[in-house]
């Protein structure tokens, strides 16, 4: 319901700071809340925009603050109005200066269809001037200069609405801003009657509110609340639900509460005066004091509240026995609620006396729509209302509203309800490898439609064309082997995503089929690689007998380690051989073979061959001569890969000697890398030199190492290579 | 829980009185009008009376005006409808209810009333 | 006073389906100073008092399902029943408030198919 509140703290004007504060309470309003000039009531008031902010301490308000230096433009009727699903409200209020001529008795003044009515000004400054009385800005009165009395007063004997208007009164030397404002609001209907032809009966509204001529409500003062407003709020609150809260130091004094017609304005609860700043006498109570205590049994007259009873009784007067009634609370709801789209099931739980029940529960949605329990249950304390919606959808978020309404008074909880769509894959799960009784998957959770975080991953599967459940294993990384499958079976797979909270399974993504392989053939035996020429490699494996009848054959997978190039070769089943052509000179490569049925067969391990070189070898490295006696000595060095060295030549000659008297020593395995010499002269100094061959030729040395033998009674000795140029 | 709880409903002859009663419960009764309303014997709804939340107004059906009397005592939170020179066109279930604005809110669980010789 | 008209006068409706109540005013009871009208149904069962279901033509009364909608405006009115359930068999009438003496339709008795 539309509960919408005009604060006009200070209607008369002096130089001190003003404000018009209009309140949304316990609703959204679908359009902004607005306050404006009321030229229909005033046609000739300043005509200056207003400058509305948001009033920084309510979610839903709207206010206008004029500074002590704009007292002068303040004068005139203003009006706030809300909209919501199509309905418009509008309260209207006045300011005047507190200096003027008269000040009215009150600032509205409500009255009932054919009631016989007073309108009344106090003189305030005493003039030799004629006084007038305008309503709506036109005049209708006047008195001659030496008959104004102390009261001005305007008689209606029979009101009628068309007596409805804002009066106004000042002396004829006045304008605008020496006038005094009031506001007569004339009830459509007789007292104690609503309805189009006013021929229903009002409900009673106590503590001075006022029943609604159009649908028979009661529009409850400031501080009061409830169906027929006869319950009080909490100290210095007010509203339909009493859950806005005046901030001052001494609660709502100083504010004059605006609500819609036929209400008015009136002092909260406490308080009177035009500014709303005297407290009530003793005995009295209510808006304005306009209430009387007649308590029972002498209990004891609180200003704000009225009688306040003690355990045992309650009513106005504290006339009825019973058990006190205690306004409902709602408890344990949280501010805000994160719910996945789908089911959903919220619970309003409130205490009270008497306990709410399930027809005073309701929850209101924030496009209005007022949902009734699906469930209900209490227990000595509370009730708890279980609603349910069952298709919750993303457009539902917003500020839901748990109301409670008992004879007790009415509560309203607004809380936020955030809406998440339940998060879904894009992509299907991509397979990277199969084999006959596995697959190896990137699951493609990313990117996804709808809300994250993703609190978990589940890749599901089950082979095509069986009725069998999808089974599913819970992901944590993007790459999963799924193992156990059958072999040459076709299988289906996709990704479902679950984000946190109740139901937060998402819908599983796209689709992705692959088959596994037959169970495969081992691969060929006695494999062997080895350097042909520049550009070719031969590799050779034993015959192939397979055991069933399907035809065959021998794949060859050959890869460069130095370059990005491969070749997959197909070999027919009954060769041995493949000659591995169009390569690079000096290159390793890589090669590995299975052999393929229908299903493919194992691979086999890798093997490494370099292709022939086509350049001279480089000269082996780090030589060294150690462990010399005075007839051997060790020679030691590295060759580099890649270069076909097929074998390592030692040349060495007693040095002054010729070159033809040299001895060779041809070492034909080129994975050695060290050699004894032997059978060597004792204390002769030999030339030693190392040569590497290749199919190309032999490498350049480019010095010579010597090497001198020991006596033959001496330890050996390290020589570490002296070097002799050539 | 808000409750009506009617009495004195039976068979009464043509041309005598019959006084209907209905006790409230869980509510502010002196707060509320309260009205009367008749279902005859498998035929619609009827409304029959009302009395405002304080007793100074009362409205009557045509068809009773002038032999039906609604009062209520707030004291005891009770309704009544007096019912004079019954006839056999009365009967029906009576039942007691309270407003909601316009619309009737809350029922009593009615009381049957036949009129015949 | 205000004659109020419903239709059909019984009505057989198998479970699950949707039921249409008609209603209709011998002058209108749309107010325009607030555009509301003045309109509310009642389910009464046998043996039982009626139980109001929908007052301002279309504003549900707490506890009654949302199966129930209330349509119309001016003089012709609707009440719908989405999905009928076992438990919505009875007798419904429609009332106006426009105006005193407030008057009801003769009912509509709903049966199940």
């Known amino acids: 319901a539309m509960d919408l509140i005009l604060i006009n703290s200070l209607p008369l004007v002096s130089d001190a700071e003003t404000s018009l504060t209009c309140i949304a309470s316990g609703w959204r309003p679908h359009e902004p809340i607005t306050i404006g000039r009321d030229f229909e009531a005033l046609m000739n008031q300043h005509q200056d925009p207003l400058e509305v902010t948001q009033d920084v301490t309510r979610e839903w308000a709207k206010k206008v603050v004029w500074k002590r230096e704009k007292a002068s433009k303040i004068n005139g009727a203003y009006f706030c109005e809300g909209r919501v699903r199509g309905e418009a409200i509008r309260i209207r209020t006045m300011k005047m200066r507190q200096q003027a001529s008269f000040l009215p008795a009150t600032l509205t003044m409500t009255v009932d269809k054919g009631d016989n009515v007073n309108i009344s000004f106090k003189k305030v400054l005493i003039k030799e001037e004629d006084a007038v009385i305008y309503k709506n800005g036109s005049f209708i009165h006047s008195v001659p200069r030496h008959e104004v009395p102390d009261i001005l007063e305007v008689h209606l004997p029979h009101a009628q609405p068309q007596d409805a208007g804002v009066y106004s009164a000042r002396y004829i030397g006045g304008n605008l801003f020496t006038s005094a404002f009031t506001r007569l609001i004339v009830r459509r209907c007789e007292a104690q009657k609503w309805g189009p032809e006013c021929n229903h009966l009002c409900t009673a509204c106590m503590n001075n509110g006022v029943c609604h001529e159009d649908t028979g409500e009661c529009i409850c003062p400031p501080g009061f609340m409830g169906r027929t407003c006869e319950k009080a709020c909490e100290l210095h609150t007010f509203g339909r639900t009493c859950k806005e809260r005046c901030s001052g130091q001494e609660g709502c004094k100083s504010y004059v509460f605006c609500l819609p017609d036929p209400y008015g304005c009136s002092c909260a609860t406490g308080w009177k005066g035009l500014q709303c700043n005297e407290a009530c006498h003793p005995g009295f109570y209510g808006p304005d004091c306009k209430l009387r205590c007649s308590c029972n049994n002498g209990e004891m007259c609180d200003r704000f509240q009225g009688c306040l009873c003690s355990p045992g009784w309650q009513g106005l007067q504290c006339e009825r026995e019973g058990i006190p009634r205690m306004t409902p609370k709602i408890v344990d709801l949280p501010d805000h609620i994160e719910v996945n789209s789908g089911k959903f099931n919220p619970i309003c739980k409130a205490s009270g006396w008497p306990l709410p029940t399930n027809e005073e529960m309701t929850l209101v949605k924030p496009d209005g729509t007022v949902l009734h329990p699906k469930d209900f249950n209490h227990t000595d304390h509370f009730s708890v209302a279980i609603f349910t919606i069952h298709r919750i959808l993303p457009p539902d978020s917003g500020v839901w509203v748990c109301s409670v309404n008992t004879v007790a008074g009415m509560v309203e909880k607004p809380f936020n309800i955030s809406v998440k769509v339940l998060p879904k894959p894009l992509n299907a799960p991509n397979v990277i490898d199969t084999g006959h009784n596995f697959a190896v998957i990137n699951i493609s959770s990313e990117p996804y439609f709808g809300d994250g975080p993703i609190k978990s991953k589940k890749l599901l599967y089950k082979p095509v064309n069986h009725y069998e459940a999808w089974q599913h294993i819970q992901v944590t990384n993007e790459i999963v082997t799924l193992n156990y499958l059958e072999p040459r079976t076709e299988y289906e797979l996709c990704v479902q995503l679950v984000r946190r909270g109740e139901g937060g399974e998402g819908h599983p993504g796209p689709v992705r089929r692959f088959t596994t392989a037959s169970i495969g053939l081992p691969p060929p035996r006695g494999l062997n690689l080895l350097p042909k020429s520049q550009t070719t490699l031969n590799l050779t494996w034993q015959p192939i007998f397979p055991s069933s009848e399907d035809d065959f054959y021998v794949e060859v997978e050959r890869r460069s380690v130095q370059k990005s190039d491969q070749q997959n070769i197909k070999v027919p089943g009954n060769l041995t051989s493949v000659l591995l052509n169009n390569l690079h000179p000096r290159e390793q490569y890589v090669v590995r073979a299975r052999v393929n049925t229908k299903a493919q067969g194992e691979w086999s391990e890798d093997l490494t061959a370099w292709t022939l070189s086509d350049i001279l070898p480089p000269q082996p490295e780090n030589i060294k001569i150690s462990n010399i006696t005075h007839s051997s000595a060790v020679i030691s060095w590295t060759i580099l890969d890649g270069y076909s060295i097929s074998s390592i030549t030692i040349r060495y000659k007693v040095q002054g000697k010729n070159e033809d008297q040299h001895v060779d020593v041809k070492i034909k395995n080129a994975t050695i890398t060290q050699y004894q010499l032997k059978g060597l002269e004792p204390e002769t100094a030999y030339q030693v030199d190392i040569f590497a061959e290749n199919n190309i030729g032999s490498s350049n040395p480019a010095f010579s190492h010597e090497l001198v033998t020991l006596p033959e009674s001496q330890a050996p000795a390290d020589l570490g290579g002296g070097k002799m140029l050539l | 829980q808000v409750q009506l709880v009617q009495s004195g409903g039976g068979v009464v002859q043509p041309g005598r009185s019959l006084r209907l009663s209905c006790a409230a419960s869980g509510l502010t009764f002196s707060n509320y009008a309260m009205h009367w309303v008749r279902q005859a014997p498998g035929k619609g709804l009827e409304w029959v009376a009302v009395?405002?939340?304080?007793?100074?107004?009362?409205y009557y059906a045509d068809s009773v005006k002038g032999r039906f009397t609604i009062s209520r005592d707030n004291s005891k939170n009770m309704l009544q409808l007096q019912m004079n020179r019954l006839r056999s066109e009365d009967t029906a279930v009576y039942y007691c209810?309270?407003?909601?604005?316009?619309?009737?809110?809350?029922w009593g669980q009615g009381t049957v009333i036949t009129v015949s010789s | 006073d205000i004659q109020m008209t419903q239709s059909p006068d019984s009505l057989a409706v198998s479970l699950g389906e949707r039921a249409t109540i008609n209603c209709k005013s011998s002058?209108?009871?749309?107010?325009?100073?607030?555009?509301?009208?003045?309109l509310a149904w009642y389910q009464q069962k046998p043996g039982q008092p009626p139980n109001l279901l929908m007052y301002?033509?279309?504003t549900r009364e707490s506890g009654v399902p949302d199966r129930f909608s209330g349509s119309g405006s001016g003089t012709d009115f609707t009440l719908t029943i989405s999905s009928l359930q076992a438990e919505d068999v009875a007798v419904y009438y429609c009332q106006q408030y426009y105006s005193a003496p407030i008057t009801f339709g003769q009912g509509t008795r709903l049966e199940i198919k």
């Open positions: 002058q209108s009871v749309l107010y325009s100073a607030n555009n509301k009208n003045y």
């Open positions: 209810a309270t407003p909601k604005g316009g619309a009737l809110e809350i």
């Open positions: 009395i405002s939340y304080d007793g100074e107004n009362k």
């Open positions: 301002w033509a279309s």
